[in-house]
């Protein structure tokens, strides 16, 4: 799923070189993106009569008309010159039409069609811009993640685009946290997905010359309820002087809440281990995976008495899990010292 | 290694029932889309149907809908077909296939053969 | 009678070069994706080529895919004779009916 957002300009269509002045209805919102001779050797775009710069929400640039989105003061008569002369390549009149952002997804499409338009370019149906970004088909997410489905389109006009959900429209108004549909990236996204968004979303793209339509498949994954996994390697077995400052990490991963501890072996009258079987230890730490840096055990200024065992020990409603790592303390005259730790403990 | 591995073909009576399996293992089955397709004697492939990882949506051919119907058990690690009302037209060697993100069947069982026939 | 069209058969001589077409429309390889896969005989079908023109690993790089259009088309290239056997072409239907997958007919390529 692509995790960002990129400003999409429609492609490039080039007006026919008729120079009757011709007029293009364009939707509130919609970028506008015009060419005019080849693209070095471009004319100069004008509105009423000023030049328009090459940088800006509305520029002309390289024989280009480009405007990010288009405003209401946008609408009027644009002139192409061609450079180094007075020759009009191109004589436009830019209409306001009704907006593309409107958040009335029950419109029918062809509302925003104008039938006397006169169109500077030739009448397209639709057709996929970047069908490279629409090849993943089948979408198999786990619950909670944001979901982006794109079917970025072209034609003339410029076509509409619809989002069907098992074949009936979908406006998001049923779906806790709605949706968002992005008009200018052909784009529909939801956020914190749950299974009840299992299905087949369809984007459905039309003109008056046309229609196309693509289909994505939406499998929401519900993880499994398992203990908590610990990472491997951690906590790793560690060597320190005395007087020097230790931290033992642990990463822990669950999707129930865990509970964190950990834990110091300790020796009671010669013995390791109770009757019961279990380690002698001595809770060092305690407290949730939401208490800030639990998972790091800080031993400041070790001594040779903080030599020995550590275990942290992950526990959520599913079960328990633990790790266990040597810290070995040589002291400070005899750094070249290392004694020989048993490997770390882990569970299956 | 993924494996994939059919049961359950055999002659069935026109009208009758037969239950396909496919046990699978070598890949985490709950996260696959997984697909069954057929092949009639001396003939090409035929779509038939395709299932979610969770099971919560199911997919068709016209060819089959309202007569079969797909489903798994993620526990068990196994895709099932229930054929009912089975014509002569359905006799056919039936794949189980892993469907892949981008769309491709990308690992094939190696078939059962259905037979319909009086 | 299959959405996606191939020829039935195709033949060449070994080390020739053979092309076989796959056509379709719009809804199908107009919007999604080819593959195309081998089916030797006696045996269940291999995914040859998938996403028009990628090959899984284990496949010859004579095996290469296009696509344009409506259209695709499977070449191979340097013929061997353990190439002779059964390629279809599939793909995606975005149909009004719902998502579904279609095949060729398959095309059965000899090797002389």
């Known amino acids: 799923l692509e995790a960002s957002e990129e400003v999409e300009l429609e492609p490039c269509l080039a007006p026919s070189l008729e120079q009757q002045e011709q007029e293009l209805t364009v939707a509130l919102g919609q970028p506008v993106r015009l060419c005019c001779g080849r693209a070095e050797r471009g004319g100069h775009w004008y509105k009423e009569g000023s030049r328009l710069a090459p940088a800006g929400r509305v520029r002309g640039w390289r024989g280009r008309l480009e405007i990010a989105s288009f405003l209401p003061e946008d609408a009027g008569r644009y002139l192409c010159l061609a450079r180094g002369s007075m020759i009009v390549l191109q004589n436009l009149t830019l209409i306001t039409g009704d907006s593309l952002t409107s958040s009335n997804d029950d419109e029918d499409p062809k509302s925003h069609r104008d039938p006397s338009n006169r169109h500077s370019y030739p009448q397209q149906a639709p057709y996929w811009t970047h069908p490279q970004r629409m090849e993943k088909k089948l979408h198999a997410v786990p619950a909670g993640n944001t979901v982006k489905f794109r079917c970025p389109a072209a034609g003339n006009p410029t076509p509409t685009i619809r989002w069907l959900k098992d074949g009936q429209a979908f406006h998001g108004e049923n779906r806790i946290g709605g949706i968002r549909l992005r008009h200018q990236h052909w784009s529909l996204v939801m956020e914190s997905v749950v299974p009840s968004d299992r299905g087949t979303y369809t984007c459905l793209v039309e003109n008056a010359v046309g229609s196309i339509r693509y289909n994505y498949l939406l499998d929401v994954l519900e993880r499994s309820p398992h203990r908590p996994i610990l990472q491997a390697g951690l906590p790793a077995n560690t060597t320190a002087v005395v007087g020097s400052d230790v931290e033992l990490l642990c990463k822990v991963y669950s999707d129930a809440q865990p509970h964190i501890q950990w834990l110091k072996h300790i020796v009671i009258n010669g013995s390791s281990f109770g009757a019961d079987g279990f380690p002698y230890v001595q809770v060092l730490k305690t407290a949730d995976i939401n208490s800030s840096e639990v998972e790091v055990l800080y031993l400041r200024n070790v001594s040779a008495e903080d030599a020995g065992e550590y275990t942290c020990l992950a526990g959520n409603s599913i079960g328990l899990s633990y790790q266990s790592a040597w810290l070995t303390v040589l002291p400070e005259e005899d750094p070249t010292w290392t004694a020989a730790a048993p490997e770390a403990r882990y569970t299956d | 290694e993924v494996q994939l591995l059919e049961s359950g073909g055999g002659l069935v009576q026109p009208g009758g029932s037969l239950r396909l399996s496919c046990a699978a293992s070598?890949?985490?089955?709950?996260?696959?889309?997984m697909s069954w397709v057929r092949q009639a004697p001396g003939k090409g492939l035929e779509w038939v149907s395709a299932?979610?990882?969770?099971?919560?949506?199911?997919y068709y051919a016209d060819s089959v809908k309202g007569r079969f119907t797909i489903s798994r058990d993620n526990s068990k690690n196994t895709l099932y077909l229930q054929m009912n009302s089975l014509r002569a037209e359905d006799t056919a060697v039936y794949y189980c296939?892993?469907?892949?993100?981008?769309?491709?069947?990308?690992?094939w069982g190696q078939g059962t053969l259905v037979t319909v026939s009086s | 009678q299959s959405v996606l069209t191939q020829p039935p058969s195709a033949s060449g001589t070994p080390g020739q070069r053979v092309t076989i077409s796959c056509s379709g429309s719009?809804?199908?390889?107009?919007?999604?994706?080819v593959h195309w896969y081998q089916q030797l005989p006696g045996t269940a079908p291999k995914l040859l080529i998938y996403?028009?023109?990628r090959r899984p690993s284990g496949v010859p790089d004579r095996f290469s895919g296009s696509k344009s259009g409506t259209s695709a088309s499977l070449a191979i290239s340097g013929l061997r004779s353990e190439d002779e056997a059964d390629y279809y072409c599939?793909?995606?239907?975005?149909?009004?009916?719902?998502?579904?997958?279609?095949f060729g007919g398959g095309t059965k390529l000899t090797v002389l």
């Open positions: 996403r028009n023109n």
């Open positions: 719009s809804s199908n390889i107009g919007s999604n994706t």
């Open positions: 599939a793909a995606w239907d975005d149909s009004l009916s719902g998502p579904n997958v279609v």
């Open positions: 070598g890949f985490t089955f709950s996260d696959y889309y």
């Open positions: 296939a892993t469907l892949a993100t981008y769309g491709p069947f990308d690992d």
């Open positions: 299932i979610s990882g969770s099971g919560g949506s199911t």
